[in-house]
Interface confidence: medium
């Protein structure tokens, strides 16, 4: 019998709040035994897979998909999904990344920290980002 | 300078089991995704399969059960696992463009092929 | 199960003219798109990813376009050397059949 595969969770570092030109890390987690996990942004209109997937902890795998510098463009709703053979996981629910200008105030954080949808709500784990250096630097027109 | 070169093709009868072998020079195969083309004589191309670098396969849906992709760290294998006159093709061995992200598993650099003739 | 047409098989063209080749596929593909080129007796080379982006070395006669399920190569300036078979082909989705190839159009020069 096929087991009841639980839905991802999606978090974005360093934050949801992001201002123009800077980078965000999407952060999608499942459990072990992932062989890809997806981003989609807006209703599958636009997605990336990767199969660059490492163990977070011993119940849960993560991949990491990066935007080196954030536009306008970037915004909007983002979630993930997994696939596990032999069938996908359900969607994490929506993660929306805001893009700001720069105002240069010292007053204005510029990210909110540990923003996070799904069932774990919690920051993502930086010490577990082991994934080979050819995974770095997501490009925006892989993601849009 | 990087390139990929086919060997193994041969006249075999049917039924007969035949491996295809990739031997790739200038990069790494844990470093892109490898694919399997073939074109039969006359004909277009046809994609059969493709070998990530974490070694999962992924088949067209006509090719799954009658054909088997496998690597070594130097080399990418193909097996015909039991080979049909209809198999009578020129295969050829594919690098493709990455190594992550399925956005980059077109194919940027080509081996010359290898003939495969099934036949009785 | 994910399908590529690519009507029609050939097509003929005179030097320094253009040329356009028509690919759809079965569903959308979001510009997970490439086009190559195959000459007689030479195996395929890329021409374009990603629907439109030009691969290294190859000249900008040559021009793919297009999104969701219709894309189009057009090429320009026509060479004799542009003599060949045009193939796309996607890589939308590995878990189904996702890299599936056109069933080629071939270019003559007259």
């Known amino acids: 019998q096929e087991e009841d595969l639980p839905r991802p969770s999606i978090s974005a570092e360093p934050g949801t709040v992001i201002p123009l030109g800077s980078h965000v890390t999407f952060v999608c987690r499942g459990p072990v035994g992932v062989q890809t996990f997806r981003l989609e942004r807006e209703s599958r209109s636009t997605y990336n897979d990767t199969e660059d997937v490492s163990q977070a902890s011993p119940s849960e795998s993560e991949a990491r998909f990066r935007i080196d510098s954030v536009s306008e463009g970037n915004a909007g709703p983002y979630r993930c999904i997994y696939y596990k053979p032999p069938k996908w996981s359900e969607q994490s629910d929506y993660l929306e990344l805001l893009v700001k200008e720069t105002s240069g105030g010292p007053d204005s954080p510029d990210t909110e920290p540990g923003s996070s949808a799904g069932p774990t709500q919690r920051p993502s784990d930086n010490s577990h980002n082991e994934h080979a250096p050819a995974s770095q630097g997501l490009k925006a027109e892989h993601l849009y | 300078s990087s390139s990929v070169e086919e060997s193994g093709g041969r006249l075999v009868t049917p039924g007969t089991p035949l491996t295809l072998t990739c031997t790739v020079s200038?990069?790494?195969?844990?470093?892109?995704?490898m694919g399997w083309v073939r074109q039969a004589p006359g004909k277009g191309l046809e994609w059969i399969g493709t070998?990530?670098?974490?070694?999962n396969t992924y088949y067209a849906s006509w090719a799954k059960g009658r054909f088997t992709i496998s690597k070594t760290s130097t080399t990418v294998d193909l097996k015909i696992t039991s080979p049909i006159t209809e198999d009578t093709a020129t295969y050829f061995c594919?690098?493709?463009?990455?190594?992550?992200?399925?956005?980059?598993?077109?194919?940027?650099?080509w081996g010359p092929g290898t003939l495969v003739t099934i036949s009785s | 199960e994910l399908v590529m047409t690519q009507p029609p098989a050939s097509v003929s063209a005179a030097v320094g003219g253009t040329v356009t080749i028509n690919c759809q596929a079965s569903?959308?593909?979001?510009?997970?798109l490439a086009w190559y080129q195959q000459r007689p007796g030479q195996p395929p080379k890329l021409l374009i990813y990603?629907?439109?982006t030009l691969a290294s070395g190859v000249p900008s006669r040559f021009k793919g376009s297009g999104s969701g399920t219709d894309y189009t190569l057009t090429i320009t300036d026509l060479e004799c050397a542009d003599a060949a078979t045009y193939y796309c082909q996607t890589y939308y989705n590995m878990m189904d059949d996702g890299a599936a190839f056109g069933g080629g159009t071939e270019v003559e020069i007259k």
């Open positions: 990603k629907a439109s």
């Open positions: 200038g990069f790494s195969l844990s470093s892109y995704v």
């Open positions: 594919a690098r493709g463009a990455g190594n992550v992200y399925y956005s980059d598993y077109y194919f940027s650099l």
């Open positions: 569903q959308n593909i979001y510009s997970n």
């Open positions: 070998i990530s670098i974490r070694s």
